[in-house]
């Protein structure tokens, strides 16, 4: 295969080929987040729509309880965009003893959880200081990259402040992964 | 196929396999937009270069009249970056009755048009408030995600203000899609 | 192949099929940059981690001396995120004769070098004016798109100011490519 003429007269073991259409894939879209208690120094995970509108999961890629479950080992492209919105951050206006305040910030992290491993792994992080001088502000953070994942790995999206996430439109805040 | 040893001695129907090299793909790059009248509340669509420089379309993925035409149903990764540029947004400077103005903003939308469906579908949106205090400003908005598309679907990129799009370099503003 | 029943009884040349798992792929992560001399008007290239942590190269995709070396011609998806961080840019505060200063900026370029071609080609550019009024600031620039590359092409990531790159975490600043 791989570019050579195919000659069926000699038995041969080929590298595993598979139809692209049966690879695990998911595109999840934002939903309004339910109020949850979360620890001060821990970024809360978003939960997602997995079947309505533009959202889907297919070929054994399942979504459950804020996690995308990886059904098969391989290299995956993983992406997410989170749109944040808020009222003016006053960080530039109040200066104590002439010293600017620590800026506010917005952060998105795509995290991998492996049951056999005690600590989650941060795969991707987008973090931005927010020091707006206008009134209400809004902006997206986009992330995407390729990672080698194992069957059973779980993926989630964590954010620095769940109350700043724009949940109003499925095209503004989303999360997806597909086996390459 | 799919990981089993290949045994040509028994007739068998296989899942559809296809060479990766013959999948529909396109990468379009920015061109200077022609002067056009557009309606106040409608985001204008960008038109694109499809064959010069870095731009290409291949394997029946065609570009015509601001649209990428999807030649085959399947899951596509779609992406775009639009770099915006402008002179100072005055939103932070003019405050009426101590109240900041509504911020200016820049928005990119990747839109799907299906002839059998009356309304376009917004697949991806990147939107950002712009309230710059320096002189000239510039910044990109990047979008990318996977969607299930049907043969005959058309994709376009719409922006909030066509006059703010940086058309000067093909690596700053672009639009692409490929069948997974 | 391509969806037809497979009939091994007649010799036939098939489109080149190949296992997805043996395609060239790399995900590189940030390391602290070594001090280097670079020319004033030339953006320095970043060097990268290619095997520790989340980083890997596989299937003849090699990393050497700041370059990813393309081992096989084809269409590649190429991506990078660079997180920048700095102290306040004062560009908005010092106005000479009522005129705002030229803004500071941060820029990422993904560049292709082809030995047979004298000039590098800029594939992707993300550039952003930075005119922050708070104290320390930080923000990412993300890029990703598909390009037709030739065997022997080399890819690198250049930045406008290497001292502003956040090298502290492998999930904040990264560079990758994979054959589609």
């Amino acid at each position: 295969l791989k570019g050579q003429e195919f000659a069926p007269s000699h038995q041969q073991v080929y590298a595993p080929l598979r139809a692209d259409g049966d690879k695990p894939r998911a595109h999840l879209t934002v939903v309004r987040q339910t109020p949850t208690q979360h620890f001060k120094n821990q970024f809360p995970a978003l939960h997602w729509e997995h079947e309505l509108g533009l959202a889907f999961t297919k070929n054994r890629m399942n979504y459950t309880n804020k996690f995308l479950l990886i059904p098969e080992s391989g290299d995956y492209f993983i992406y997410s965009q989170v749109t944040f919105r808020g009222m003016t951050s006053e960080c530039s206006e109040i200066r104590q003893a002439g010293r600017p305040n620590k800026p506010d910030s917005i952060t998105v992290v795509i995290t991998k959880v492996t049951d056999s491993y005690p600590e989650p792994t941060q795969l991707l992080m987008g973090t931005k200081s927010v020091c707006e001088v206008g009134s209400n502000w809004f902006q997206p953070i986009y992330l995407g990259a390729m990672f080698s994942l194992q069957e059973g790995d779980k993926l989630m999206v964590n954010v620095s402040d769940i109350s700043l996430v724009d949940y109003t439109k499925e095209d503004k805040t989303f999360f997806g992964a597909f086996l390459l | 196929l799919k990981g089993q040893e290949f045994a040509p001695s028994h007739q068998q129907v296989y899942a559809p396999l296809r060479a990766d090299g013959d999948k529909p793909r396109a990468h379009l790059t920015v061109v200077r937009q022609t002067p056009t009248q557009h309606f106040k509340n409608q985001f204008p669509a960008l038109h694109w270069e499809h064959e010069l420089g870095l731009a290409f379309t291949k394997n029946r993925m065609n570009y015509t009249n601001k649209f990428l035409l999807i030649p085959e149903s399947g899951d596509y990764f779609i992406y775009s970056q639009v770099t915006f540029r402008g002179m100072t947004s005055e939103c932070s400077e003019i405050r009426q009755a101590g109240r900041p103005n509504k911020p200016d903003s820049i928005t990119v939308v990747i839109t799907k048009v299906t002839d059998s469906y009356p309304e376009p579908t917004q697949l991806l949106m990147g939107t950002k408030s712009v309230c710059e205090v320096g002189s000239n400003w510039f910044q990109p908005i990047y979008l990318g995600a996977m969607f299930s598309l049907q043969e005959g679907d058309k994709l376009m990129v719409n922006v909030s203000d066509i006059s703010l799009v940086d058309y000067t370099k093909e690596d700053k503003t672009f639009f692409g899609a490929f069948l997974l | 192949l391509k969806g037809q029943e497979f009939a091994p009884s007649h010799q036939q040349v098939y489109a080149p099929l190949r296992a997805d798992g043996d395609k060239p792929r790399a995900h590189l992560t940030v390391v602290r940059q070594t001090p280097t001399q670079h020319f004033k008007n030339q953006f320095p290239a970043l060097h990268w981690e290619h095997e520790l942590g989340l980083a890997f190269t596989k299937n003849r995709m090699n990393y050497t001396n700041k370059f990813l070396l393309i081992p096989e011609s084809g269409d590649y998806f190429i991506y990078s995120q660079v997180t920048f961080r700095g102290m306040t840019s004062e560009c908005s505060e010092i106005r000479q004769a009522g005129r705002p200063n030229k803004p500071d900026s941060i820029t990422v370029v993904i560049t292709k070098v082809t030995d047979s071609y004298p000039e590098p080609t800029q594939l992707l550019m993300g550039t952003k004016s930075v005119c922050e009024v708070g104290s320390n600031w930080f923000q990412p620039i993300y890029l990703g798109a598909m390009f037709s590359l030739q065997e022997g092409d080399k890819l690198m990531v250049n930045v406008s100011d290497i001292s502003l790159v956040d090298y502290t975490k492998e999930d904040k600043t990264f560079f990758g490519a994979f054959l589609l």
Epitope: - | T34, P35, T36, E49, M87, D161, S163, T168 | R99
Partner: antibody
Framework: QVQLVQSGAEVKKPGASVKVSCKAS????????INWVRQAPGQGLEWMGW????????GYAQKFQGRVTMTADRSTSTAYMELSSLRSEDTAVYYC????????????WGQGTLVTVSS | QSVLTQPPSVSGAPGQRVTISCTSS?????????VHWYQQLPGTAPKLLIE???NRPSGVPDRFSGSKSGTSASLTITGLLPEDEGDYYC??????????FGGGTKLTVLG
């Protein structure tokens, strides 16, 4: 140094066409857009459109749409502006100007070509 | 249709300072690329004086400066010289991507 040298004056009858040339030197012709601007006697400047010499793409002012054609010959680094269906009010000096990509200001100008439309 | 409005004429004695204004009828003019200023001396082609509201191309004396306030741009000439006499035009791009010129201002240097 950058130079834009235009063709000589023309006298045309109403309904005819005129083609003005603008030869560029001192820079890479395909790297900068060329604009055409005209000035009727004793009047102000009026923009007609732009031409990208590399791709041949053009953008015309609405007023001239359908009557103006801008082209480039890359082999000779020459831009052309053709205006058809001439009328007496098209009598003007026609300028080509090279644009600054970043700001779209008109940085270098040709010396101008007087086109007189008279029966 | 957007317009840029300039005063038809201004004048000043040598050594004086004059300011020419350029007011836009629409907020989208100049939003992307600013306002540019050109000088046209009698019988010659226009010459770029100021680009993007403020910036002087090399070779333009620092007697010429540009500024912006709200929807207006201004060109200021200090230390007026007799050779500054001529026409001055502001120019910008509107939201439909068409270039616009102001009507022009005739500068007369007195005496």
């Amino acid at each position: 140094q950058v130079q834009l040298v235009q063709s000589g004056a023309e006298v045309k009858k109403p309904g005819a066409s005129v083609k003005v040339s603008c030869k560029a030197s001192g820079y890479t012709f395909t790297s900068y857009d060329i604009n055409w601007v005209r000035q009727a006697p004793g009047q102000g400047l009026e923009w007609m459109g732009w031409l990208n010499p590399n791709s041949g793409n053009t953008g015309y002012a609405q007023k001239f749409q359908g009557r103006v054609t801008m082209t480039a010959d890359r082999s000779t680094s020459t831009a052309y502006m053709e205006l058809s269906s001439l009328r007496s009010e098209d009598t003007a000096v026609y300028y080509c100007a090279r644009e600054v990509p970043e700001t779209a200001a008109f940085e270098y100008w040709g010396q101008g070509t007087l086109v007189t439309v008279s029966s | 249709q957007s317009v840029l409005t300039q005063p038809p004429s201004v004048s000043g004695a040598p050594g004086q300072r004059v300011t020419i204004s350029c007011t836009s009828s629409s907020s989208d003019i100049g939003a992307a690329l600013g306002v540019h200023w050109y000088q046209q001396l009698p019988g010659t082609a226009p010459k770029l004086l100021i680009e993007g509201y403020y910036n002087r191309p090399s070779g333009v004396p620092d007697r010429f400066s540009g500024s912006k306030s709200g929807t207006s741009a201004s060109l200021t000439i200090t230390g007026l010289l007799p050779e500054d006499e001529g026409d001055y035009y502001c120019q910008s791009w509107d939201g439909t991507l068409s270039a616009l010129f102001g009507g022009g201002t005739k500068l007369t240097v007195l005496g």
